[in-house]
């Protein structure tokens, strides 16, 4: 039962994260939550950084600055793969939740 619940939580979190990505950066509150998660957990996107390519409001070859290893204004524009966190946030934050919750 515990595994079923955990999988359900992870599925919900994945859906919610992707939903919030759709609103980035149009919704200030959503943007700040996503940026906080990506910066604090050193991750980018839901599954990985390529998820940002599918977001209409994000120009091509752009990820949020919060994906960058060294955050500075504009670092996510025309990014170099070596300069950003490539791991997805759902798995990374999920791993942290499994350990700590």
């Amino acid at each position: 039962a515990g595994y079923v619940f955990r999988d359900k939580v992870m599925s919900e979190f994945n859906n919610n994260f992707r939903q919030q990505m759709e609103n980035y950066p149009k919704n200030n509150h959503t943007a700040s939550i996503l940026d906080r998660m990506q910066a604090d957990f050193k991750c980018c996107g839901a599954a990985n950084y390529t998820d940002w390519e599918k977001i209409p409001s994000m120009s091509k070859n752009r990820v949020p600055d919060s994906c960058c290893i060294n955050v500075t204004v504009g670092c996510g524009i025309n990014f170099n793969e070596k300069a950003i966190h490539k791991e997805g946030c759902v798995e990374k934050i999920g791993g942290w939740l499994r350990k700590n919750v």
């Epitope: 200030n28 943007a31 604090d40 120009s59 949020p64």
Partner: antibody, heavy 118, light 108 residues
């Protein structure tokens, strides 16, 4: 609700250093760019620079040689130091927040007037 | 640096009228990173529009932004008494970030 509050002396002597602090309350200092902006009748609104929680800074080239912005994450504060001030540095100084998604300066402090005079 | 020129300097209108404010950049604004702010006497500027056309949280829908490249516009569809203030545009696409000189919207 996040609020910003500037503090520091309102009067600074020419050639001395202007020091201001911005205290962030009601929210975290992480995951934002923290800025200083000033406003005077002569120059209008002028961006001074920003700092990120990691310590990364970017300054306006016109002030770069005289400016230092620092951050204290434990106190939820960031500070401005402007040295060798002249009367031209007399202005209202604001601190302001910008999100990493580049949502411009969405939250401002109320501003503090700094006069440079002997 | 990018120089922003706002026009007109002063706009005299009556409540209920439409206000159109212009902001022209000396060179193209990267990613349309252009914002509009409203400032009233003795107060800090308040963000209205960012990214040229996105309304900030809590801003009424009578405020709208448009434009790209070097030409940008802030439109207030129907002026309310509280809208009479000074409006500034700002670009944050290229460092140093710069502001326009402002447009004052006053009661006719």
């Amino acid at each position: 609700q996040v609020q910003l509050q500037e503090s520091g002396p309102g009067l600074v002597k020419p050639s001395e250093t202007l020091s201001l602090t911005c205290t962030v309350s009601g929210g975290s200092i992480s995951s934002y760019y923290w800025n200083w902006i000033r406003q005077s009748p002569e120059k209008g609104l002028e961006w001074i620079g920003y700092i990120y929680i990691s310590g990364t800074t970017n300054y306006n080239p016109s002030l770069k040689s005289r400016v230092t912005i620092s951050v204290d994450t434990f106190k939820n504060q960031f500070s401005l130091k402007l040295n060798s001030v002249t009367a031209a540095d007399t202005a209202v100084y604001y601190c302001a927040r910008m999100g990493l998604g580049r949502e411009a300066f969405d939250i401002w402090g109320q501003g503090t007037m700094v006069t440079v005079s002997s | 640096e990018i120089v922003l020129t706002q026009s007109p300097g002063t706009l005299s209108l009556s409540p209920g009228e439409r206000a159109t404010l212009s902001c022209r950049a000396s060179q193209s604004v990267s990613n349309n990173y252009l914002a509009w702010y409203q400032q009233k006497p003795g107060q800090a500027p308040r963000l209205l529009i960012y990214g040229a056309s996105s309304r900030a949280t809590g801003i009424p829908d009578r405020f709208s932004g448009s434009g790209s490249g070097t030409d940008f516009t802030l439109t207030i569809s129907r002026l309310e008494p509280e809208d009479f203030a000074v409006y500034y545009c700002q670009q944050y696409g290229s460092s140093p970030w710069t502001f326009g000189q402002g447009t004052k919207v006053e009661i006719k």
